[in-house]
C-alpha cells in the first residue's frame, strides 16, 4: 500500500532572485484533489493553502509581497489528499538581491578579444563578503562562483565566440543574500565562427531568465507563468 503521494513541483515566479522589498510568488503543483498544501521554509511551516474546489485545482500560489533577508532561504512544499501526505518537493532556493552595495565588474585583457585568448573577469566589492557570483545573460546563462576578500577572479580560459555576451556579477553575503548586480560588461569575441559549435551549452537558466529578473527589479511586475525550473538552483548548492 502506498504510504506517500508523489512529490510536488515548486518554483518561483517571476524569478528565484528577488530584489528586496519586491514581490514574489512561490508556486506548488501537486495533484487534483489535494485538500491542503503546506509551504515549509528552512524546516518550519511557512504557509498553508486549501484549494477550493480541490478536484479542479492542482496548483497553489503563495504570495510574498515584500521580500527581505528573513524570507531568503530554502523552501519546499507538500500536499495532502485525504489523510495521505506527499513526499516533499525539491528545495527552492529563494535569494534576496539588492542588499547593501554594488560590485564592480571588469575584464582582462579587455572587452574585445580574439578567439583563443585567455580572458579573466574580476568582481570587486569592498564590503564584507567573500563569495562572488558571475552570471552571463542568455539561453545558456552560466553562473560561476568565486572567492576572495574583496575581489574574485573568474578565469574563462581560452575563449570562443560562444563566450560572447553580457556579464554581471554579485557579491554574496550568504547563499541567499546577494548584493545589487554590477553594471554589465559586454564581452566581444571575434574569431572562427565554426568553432562555436564545439562550445558546450550550459542550460542553467531558461532563455529569458535575466530579462525577467531585470523586469522585476525595475518595475516589480508579476509574470503569471513559470520561468524558473528548480533544477537550475543547483548553482546554490
Amino acid at each position: 500500500q502506498q504510504q506517500t503521494l508523489p512529490k510536488p513541483f515548486i518554483w518561483a515566479e517571476p524569478h528565484f532572485m528577488v530584489p528586496k522589498e519586491k514581490q514574489v510568488t512561490i508556486c506548488c503543483q501537486g495533484n487534483y484533489g489535494a485538500v491542503e498544501y503546506q509551504l515549509h521554509f528552512e524546516g518550519s511551516l511557512f504557509a498553508v493553502d486549501r484549494p477550493k474546489p480541490p478536484e479542479r485545482i492542482n496548483k497553489v500560489k503563495f504570495y510574498i509581497p515584500d521580500m527581505n533577508s528573513r524570507m531568503a532561504g530554502q523552501y519546499s512544499c507538500i500536499y495532502r489528499v485525504g489523510e495521505l501526505w506527499s513526499e516533499p518537493s525539491n528545495l527552492l532556493d529563494l535569494v534576496v538581491t539588492e542588499m547593501y552595495d554594488t560590485p564592480t565588474l571588469s575584464v582582462h585583457p579587455g572587452p574585445e578579444v580574439i578567439s583563443g585568448e585567455k580572458v579573466t573577469f574580476y568582481c570587486r566589492l569592498d564590503t564584507a563578503t567573500s563569495m562572488f557570483l558571475l552570471l552571463k545573460e542568455g539561453r545558456s546563462s552560466h553562473v560561476q562562483r568565486g572567492y576572495g576578500k574583496v575581489q574574485a577572479e573568474f578565469p574563462l580560459g581560452p575563449v570562443t565566440t560562444a563566450h560572447r555576451g553580457t556579464y554581471r556579477c554579485f557579491g554574496s553575503y550568504n547563499n541567499h543574500a546577494w548584493s545589487f548586480p554590477s553594471e554589465p560588461v559586454k564581452l566581444l569575441v571575434t574569431g572562427d565562427i565554426e568553432n562555436t559549435s564545439l562550445a558546450p551549452e550550459d542550460p542553467t537558466f531558461p532563455a529569458d531568465t535575466w530579462g525577467t529578473y531585470l523586469l522585476t527589479t525595475e518595475t516589480g511586475l508579476q509574470k503569471d507563468h513559470a520561468l524558473w525550473d528548480h533544477t537550475a538552483q543547483n548553482l546554490l548548492r
Partner: nanobody
C-alpha cells in the same frame, strides 16, 4: 500603509475567557491575510492562529480547540476569542497582516507578515 491596533487584553483567571480585537486602518483589510502571534516574557514570538482572506483558519497545536480566530471585513477588524485560558497563555498578543495576498493563503511564519500591531497584554493568574 496599514495600521493595526490591538485591544481587549487584561488579567483573567485560569479557565476564563477573553476576546481580543485588532482594528485595521485603510481599505486593504479585505485583501489581507491576518494572524495572531504572542510573546511571553523571555521567550521568542510564536504563532497562535491565522486566517486567510477567504476565512480559512489555522491554529497552533497549543491553542487548538480553545481559541477561535475570525474577521469582520465590514468593520475592518480581526478577533481572537480565547477560552479555557491557562497560565502558559500569558503573553503580549500581536496582530499581524500580509498585504496583499491570494485568497486561500494562510501564513504561519512571522517572517511572512509585513504589518504588525503594538500588542496587547494578556495575563492569566489565579
Amino acid at each position: 500603509e496599514v495600521q493595526l491596533v490591538e485591544s481587549g487584553g487584561g488579567e483573567v483567571q485560569p479557565g476564563g475567557s477573553l476576546r481580543l480585537s485588532c482594528a485595521a486602518s485603510g481599505r486593504t483589510f479585505a485583501s489581507a491575510a491576518m494572524g495572531w502571534f504572542r510573546q511571553a516574557p523571555g521567550k521568542e514570538r510564536e504563532f497562535v492562529a491565522a486566517i486567510s482572506r477567504s476565512d480559512d483558519t489555522y491554529y497552533a497545536e497549543s491553542v487548538k480547540g480553545r481559541f477561535t480566530i475570525s474577521r469582520d471585513n465590514a468593520k475592518n477588524t480581526l478577533y481572537l476569542q480565547m477560552s479555557s485560558l491557562r497560565a502558559e497563555d500569558t503573553a503580549v498578543y500581536y496582530c499581524a497582516a500580509v498585504v496583499p495576498t491570494y485568497g486561500n493563503n494562510i501564513y504561519v511564519h512571522s517572517a511572512a507578515y509585513n504589518y504588525w500591531g503594538q500588542g496587547t497584554l494578556v495575563t492569566v493568574k489565579p
